[in-house]
């Protein structure tokens, strides 16, 4: 038993304070900004990382077409409510009282009302689409072989059960993944699409969550895979309700 | 390596407090949780409480709430408990142990014989 | 508060015996769970935390195994020096929780 062994961190969430304080001394790590006890075996809920990042000091064609009920997070950052169990709650207001709706990945879903706004449950985000462009390199990539790099990121830096990645798509220099994850085929303990997207996301900005690890070093074959632009697509299991000013803007 | 050092046998009156001390060294004393472990002759054991010196935060087991008293003295690196209002009940061999992740180093033991 | 059941409560065996010692919880303790040994005028020595992992310097006949809330400590060739009272502990939750020990004897 090792000095290495003793380390209380969270190694999947850096956001947190942890202290060997729990029964029989076990590490317990609490989110930042929420104080919220993670589990530092998996990945912490996005409203949770939201919740901690706000709290922290500022500083610095084969290709899919998204379908028109998809949304993009335009709204950015915003310090998000969350429930007990760190998912998103349906409502988010902000200090001015001003409400609106979110889904399962805290993205607007519904136009912005007052404190009357009625959001009758979380909407799931069942299907992501991650729109990546890559940095001109001296020839496209392998398609079979990104395909395997990319799912084997998912699984293993991000834990998210392969049959989750419904696919990968490759005109150069776009790439694209999907990820879907129904409500029934979400099993207890399995990630949550939305999570591994978001841990994505900021390991694509170099902004990694994780303890101490290195940024991410996507290699294909040996060839490096960088990323100069991305987009995030958000479906979900009931279309978003905005109205039609919004929808012809 | 890992000591805790128990402090030595204690005859009490019933009715009356004895404190006795755990000093630990070889490693950082705020950076672990101290438990303090009951142990009746011929019975098993009972966990009494836990204290983690690095905030002063405790936890009791409630069937010694009241009965005992868990503090800790970083500047010398040692864990004290307090128990109150003896009876013959109470003795017993208490150890005092570290914990990390369930695993644990012990004291030798404090044995506590109330006796009129 | 999460009971633990040992059993046996005592059991007597022969040098280079297998021998197994099981723990059960009161509901799933998520595989924090330790064994210690105890032997008369000693401290407790801790043989097994996080239900399988060896503490170092104790034998490798010393094995754990289990999970939810049925657990086993297994001493593959019985030792004279293995003789003692063996505990379990829960550390899933507040407050921890002790079996009630197995006492081992030479046949």
């Known amino acids: 038993h090792t000095a290495a062994q003793d380390n209380c961190t969270c190694p999947t969430n850096k956001m947190t304070v942890c202290s060997p304080d729990g029964p029989g001394g076990r590490c317990q790590c609490r989110a930042l900004g929420s104080g919220m006890a993670v589990d530092c075996s998996t990945l912490t809920s996005k409203c949770l990382l939201l919740k901690a990042r706000m709290s922290a000091p500022k500083n610095a064609r084969t290709l899919v077409r998204p379908s028109e009920h998809a949304l993009v997070d335009n709204d950015g950052l915003y310090d998000p409510d969350c429930d007990p169990e760190g998912r998103f709650k349906a409502r988010q207001c902000n200090q001015t009282s001003v409400c609106w709706c979110v889904n399962s990945v805290g993205v607007r879903r519904t136009d912005k009302g007052d404190l009357s706004l009625r959001c009758d449950e979380l909407v799931r985000t069942h299907h992501i689409l991650i729109d990546l462009r890559h940095r001109p390199t001296a020839g496209a990539f392998n398609h079979s072989d990104l395909d395997a790099e990319l799912r084997r990121l998912f699984r293993e830096r991000y834990r998210l059960h392969p049959k989750f990645v419904a696919a990968v798509h490759y005109e150069q220099p776009t790439i694209q993944i999907e990820l879907r994850q129904n409500t029934s085929q979400k099993a207890a303990g399995d990630v949550d699409i939305g999570d591994a997207a978001y841990y994505f996301e900021r390991d694509i900005k170099g902004e990694s969550l994780f303890q101490g690890r290195g940024g991410l070093d996507l290699r294909v074959r040996g060839e490096p895979l960088q990323v100069e632009r991305t987009l995030i697509y958000y479906l979900d299991e009931i279309p978003p309700k905005f109205s039609m000013k919004r929808l012809t803007a | 390596q890992v000591q805790l050092q128990q402090s030595g046998p204690e005859v009490v009156k019933p009715g009356a407090s004895v404190k006795m001390s755990c000093k630990a060294s070889?490693?950082?004393?705020?950076?672990?949780?101290i438990n303090w472990v009951k142990q009746r002759t011929g019975q098993g054991l009972e966990w009494i409480g836990q204290?983690?010196?690095?905030?002063?935060?405790?936890h009791y087991n409630k069937n010694f709430k009241g009965k005992a008293t868990l503090t800790a003295d970083k500047s010398s690196n040692t864990a004290y408990m307090q128990l109150n209002s003896l009876t013959s009940e109470d003795s017993a061999v208490y150890f005092c142990?570290?914990?990390?992740?369930?695993?644990?180093?012990w004291g030798q033991g404090t044995l506590v014989t109330v006796s009129a | 508060d999460i009971k633990m059941t040992q059993s046996p409560s005592s059991m007597y065996a022969f040098l280079g015996e297998r021998v197994t010692i099981t723990c059960k919880a009161s509901?799933?303790?998520?595989?924090?769970l330790s064994w210690f040994q105890l032997k008369p005028g000693k401290s407790p020595k801790s043989l097994i935390y996080?239900?399988?992992r060896l503490v170092d310097g104790v034998p490798s006949r010393f094995s754990g195994s289990g999970s939810g809330q049925d657990y086993s400590l297994t001493i593959s060739s019985l030792d004279y020096e293995d003789m003692g009272i063996y505990y379990c502990?829960?550390?899933?939750?507040?407050?921890?929780?002790f079996g009630g020990g197995t006492k081992l004897e030479l046949k």
């Open positions: 142990a570290r914990f990390f992740e369930g695993l644990a180093y």
């Open positions: 509901q799933g303790i998520n595989n924090y």
């Open positions: 502990l829960q550390y899933d939750e507040f407050p921890l929780t």
């Open positions: 204290i983690y010196p690095g905030s002063d935060s405790f």
């Open positions: 070889g490693y950082r004393f705020t950076d672990y949780v």
């Open positions: 996080r239900a399988n």
